[in-house]
Interface confidence: medium
C-alpha cells in the first residue's frame, strides 16, 4: 500500500511521541558523538516537518523517502568533517549508498565515556525538573553506545525507566527503591543490545537466508503446535521487522512490528496458547512479551521424523522440487520436536542433511546412501551437551570469578593477538553463562548455553572486524555463523604468537585501586592476568594461580596500610619480581 | 528548576590564571564536570570531581587545571593555570561529571586567553 507521504503515514500510524522518540534513537545510532541538544533541535525539526505533511500530503519535500529526509537533516550538521572525518563524504552520495554509507560508520565500540550514575536526588531532580528532557536523554546515551539496539524495544526500556522513576522518587527509601530496578534495565538492555548485534550480523553478513533459517528453528521450538504455514508467515514478517531495524528503517520497523503483534495476537489459536497473557498488555510490552513468550507444549502425537526424511523414497524428488522449502520443513519438524537443542545445533543438523543430500541424491542408490544420515548428527548432538556439562561442573567448582578467569586463559592462550580489553570484557561475558545457565533443568542448559555463547562471540567478531590482528578470529567469525561456537572451542595454543615483551608499567598499582569497586577491581586483576599469559602463553594454571593469589594479597595489604601508596609503590616491585620469578 | 551559574571568567595573557566558579541551587550534588565549547567546535569534558573525590581531566588541560568542591557552599570550582590561547571558550559547568549533563546548561562563562 503505497502513500503519497511516507513520513506522513509513519507519524500517523506511531503517534507523536513513538515517532519522535524513534527518529531521535535513529540519529543517535548514525551521529554517536553528536551533543544531545544538537539531536534534540534535529527531532524537532523533523518532527514539525512531519506535521506540515500531515496535514498536507502534497506539500513541498513531503513525497520524498525517509532516507532522504533523514540523510539531509543529519548532513546539516555543521560539524560533520571535524567530528566524524570520512564520514561525511556520505554526504556526498545520493541515496540509497547515502544511507548505506551511514550503516558503514556505526562504531560498535564508540570512544564515549561510561555512564556514571550520580545520587539518586540528582536523577529524581532532573526527573522532576523536566521529565521529557530526562526520557529524551536515556533513549540518546544509550541508542549512542548502543548503534544496533532494537529501537522499538528500547522505546519499552524507556518506558520502563520512566516508571522506575516515576515510582522510586515518591519512595521513603527512594536509592533502596531505584537502584534495583536500574540495575536491572541496564542488565537487561546490554543483554538485548547483544542479541539484536547478532540479529544484525546475521542478516548483513550472511543474508538473510540465514536469519530465517536462525527464525525457523527459534519459532519451531516457540509454537510447535503451529503449522509449518503459519511458522513461515511469522519467519516472513520477523525478517522484515529485523531487516528494516537493522538497516537503520526504525520507523518502518516499529511499525511493521506492531502489526506482526497484531496479527499474533489475532491468531493466536493457530500460533500458540501461551499469548494470552501478552495480548492484553499495551503495545510496547505486548510486543516485548511476545518476543520473550515461553515454549508451547509439544503436540502430544509427533510422528517419527525418520519416516518421511529418511525412509520414504521420495525424498530426494521432494527436495529437488523446492530445496528450501524442503530444509525448512525438515527443521522445523526436528525443532518442535526439540526445545532442548539450541538454535544453533539444530542448524547445524539442517546443514549436515543438506549436504548428505546434495551428496545422495547424486549417487546410485540415493535411498541406500542417506539411510544412515540420522546416525551421523549424534556426534554433532554429543559435542555441545559435553561442552556445557564440562563447564557447568567448572563452574559449580570455582564459581564465577574464577571461571571467567579459567575462561580468560583459555582464550588468550587461542587467540593472544586480541586486545587485552576485548579479551577481558568477552571473557567476563562468556563466563556469565555459568549463572545463567548452569542451574537450569537438563532440557533448558544447551539451548540456554550455546545460544548465549553466540550472542557473546559475536561480540568478539564485531569488535575483532574493526581492527582485525588475528586470522584465527577473522576465520571463526566469517566462514560459518552456525559454527563459529565449535570454531573458537577448537582453537588451540597459537604456537606461532610470539609472546608479548614484559613492561613493569602494566603491573604497577597505586592506591586508587583501593577506592574502586568489587567489579572494577576484579577487571583490574583480569586485565593484569591477560597480561600475564601474553607474556607467558606456556604458564601452567598452577603458575598463574600463584602470581593471582600473590597479586590480591598484595592489594589487600597495601590497601589495609596507612600509607597506601607508599606500600603500593615498595611491595609493587617485589610483587612483580617474585612473578617474574614464578614464571620464569 | 536547579539553576547552574558559573562565573569568574575573563580576559587573560597566556601564562595567567583564573578560577572559575559554579554554584548549583538548592542543594549539593555529585559528580560535578566542567565542560568548555569553544566557537565552531562542539562542547567538551574539561574535568570532573565524583562523588568520592576522585578527579579526572582532559589531556590537554592535565597539570593546568584543578576541579575542587565546597560542599558547604554547592559550589564546584576549576582552577586554571598557565593558560593558552586554545583553553579560549565558553565553560560550563553541570551535574554528572565526564562527558554526562544531567540539567539544562546555565549561560557558562567566557574566558578569553590572548596577548
Known amino acids: 500500500d503505497t502513500h503519497k507521504s511516507e513520513v506522513a503515514h509513519r507519524f500517523k500510524d506511531l503517534g507523536e511521541e513513538h515517532f519522535k522518540g524513534l527518529v531521535l534513537v535513529a540519529f543517535s545510532q548514525y551521529l554517536q558523538q553528536c551533543p544531545f541538544e544538537e539531536h534534540v533541535k534535529l527531532v524537532n525539526e523533523v518532527t514539525e516537518f512531519a506535521k506540515t505533511c500531515v496535514a498536507d500530503e502534497s506539500a513541498e519535500n513531503c513525497d520524498k523517502s525517509l532516507h532522504t529526509l533523514f540523510g539531509d537533516k543529519l548532513c546539516t550538521v555543521a560539524t560533520l568533517r571535524e567530528t566524524y572525518g570520512e564520514m561525511a563524504d556520505c554526504c556526498a552520495k545520493q541515496e540509497p549508498e547515502r544511507n548505506e554509507c551511514f550503516l558503514q560508520h556505526k562504531d560498535d565500540n564508540p570512544n564515549l565515556p561510561p555512564l556514571v550514575r550520580p545520587e539518586v536526588d540528582v536523577m529524581c531532580t532532573a526527573f522532576h525538573d523536566n521529565e521529557a528532557t530526562f526520557l529524551k536523554k536515556y533513549l540518546y546515551e544509550v541508542a549512542r553506545r548502543h548503534p544496533y539496539f532494537y529501537a522499538p524495544e528500547l522505546l519499552f526500556f524507556a518506558a520502563r525507566y520512566k516508571a522506575a522513576f516515576a515510582e522510586c522518587c515518591q519512595a521513603a527509601d527512594k536509592a533502596a527503591c531505584l537502584l534495583p530496578k536500574l540495575d536491572e534495565l541496564r542488565d537487561e538492555g546490554k543483554a538485548s543490545s547483544a542479541k539484536q548485534r547478532l540479529k544484525c550480523a546475521s542478516l548483513q553478513k550472511f543474508g538473510d537466508r540465514a536469519f530465517k533459517a536462525w527464525a525457523v528453528a527459534r519459532l519451531s521450538q516457540k509454537f510447535p503446535k503451529a503449522e509449518f504455514a503459519e511458522v513461515s508467515k511469522l519467519v516472513t514478517d520477523l525478517t522484515k521487522v529485523h531487516t528494516e531495524c537493522c538497516h537503520g528503517d526504525l520507523l518502518e520497523c516499529a511499525d511493521d512490528r506492531a502489526d506482526l503483534a497484531k496479527y499474533m495476537c489475532e491468531n493466536q489459536d493457530s500460533i500458540s496458547s501461551k499469548l494470552k497473557e501478552c495480548c492484553d498488555k499495551p503495545l510496547l510490552e505486548k510486543s516485548h512479551c511476545l518476543a520473550e513468550v515461553e515454549n508451547d507444549e509439544m503436540p502430544a502425537d509427533l510422528p517419527s521424523l525418520a519416516a518421511d526424511y529418511v525412509e520414504s523414497k521420495d525424498v530426494c524428488k521432494n527436495y529437488a522440487e523446492a530445496k528450501d522449502v524442503f530444509l525448512g520443513m525438515f527443521l522445523y519438524e526436528y525443532a518442535r520436536r526439540h526445545p532442548d537443542y539450541s538454535v544453533m545445533l539444530l542448524l547445524r543438523l539442517a546443514k549436515a542433511y543438506e549436504a548428505t543430500l546434495e551428496k545422495c541424491c547424486a549417487a546410485a542408490d540415493p535411498h541406500e546412501c542417506y539411510a544412515k544420515v540420522f546416525d551421523e548428527f549424534q556426534p554433532l548432538v554429543e559435542e555441545p551437551q559435553n561442552l556445557v556439562k564440562q563447564n557447568c561442573e567448572l563452574f559449580e567448582q570455582l564459581g564465577e570469578y574464577k571461571f571467567q578467569n579459567a575462561l580468560l586463559v583459555r582464550y588468550t592462550k587461542k587467540v593472544p593477538q586480541v586486545s587485552t580489553p576485548t579479551l577481558v570484557e568477552v571473557s567476563r561475558n562468556l563466563g556469565k553463562v555459568g549463572a545463567k545457565c548452569c542451574k537450569l533443568p537438563e532440557a533448558k542448559r544447551m539451548p540456554c548455553a550455546e545460544d548465549y555463547l553466540s550472542v557473546v562471540l559475536n561480540r568478539l567478531c564485531v569488535l575483532h572486524e574493526k581492527t582485525p590482528v588475528s586470522e584465527k578470529v577473522t576465520k571463526c567469525c566469517t566462514e560459518s555463523l552456525v559454527n563459529r561456537r565449535p570454531c573458537f572451542s577448537a582453537l588451540e595454543l597459537d604456537e606461532a604468537y610470539v609472546p608479548k615483551a614484559f613492561n613493569a608499567e602494566t603491573f604497577t598499582f597505586h592506591a586508587d585501586m583501593c577506592t574502586l569497586s568489587e567489579k572494577e577491581k576484579q577487571v583490574k586483576k583480569q586485565t593484569a592476568l591477560v597480561e600475564l599469559v601474553k607474556h607467558k602463553p606456556k604458564a601452567t594454571k598452577e603458575q598463574l594461580k600463584g602470581v593471582m593469589d600473590n597479586f590480591a594479597a598484595f592489594v589487600e595489604k597495601c590497601c589495609k596500610a596507612d600509607d597506601k601508596e607508599a606500600c603500593f609503590a615498595e611491595e609493587g616491585p617485589k610483587f612483580v619480581a617474585a612473578s617474574q620469578a614464578a614464571l620464569a | 528548576q536547579v539553576q547552574l551559574v558559573e562565573s569568574g571568567g575573563g580576559s587573560v595573557q597566556p601564562g595567567g590564571s583564573l578560577r572559575l566558579s559554579c554554584a548549583a541551587s538548592g542543594r549539593n550534588f555529585n559528580p560535578m564536570g566542567w565542560f568548555r565549547q569553544a566557537p565552531g567546535k562542539q562542547r567538551e569534558s574539561v574535568a570532573a570531581?565524583?562523588?568520592?573525590?576522585?578527579?579526572k581531566y582532559a589531556d590537554s588541560v592535565k597539570g593546568r587545571f584543578t576541579i575542587s568542591r565546597d560542599n558547604g557552599k554547592n559550589t564546584v570550582y576549576l582552577q586554571m593555570n598557565s593558560l593558552k590561547s586554545e583553553d579560549t571558550a565558553v565553560y560550563y559547568c553541570?551535574?554528572?561529571?565526564?562527558?554526562?549533563?544531567?540539567?539544562?546548561w546555565g549561560r557558562g562563562t567566557q574566558v578569553s586567553v590572548s596577548s
Open positions: 570531581i565524583g562523588t568520592d573525590g576522585s578527579t
Open positions: 553541570n551535574v554528572g561529571g565526564w562527558g554526562i549533563s544531567w540539567f539544562p
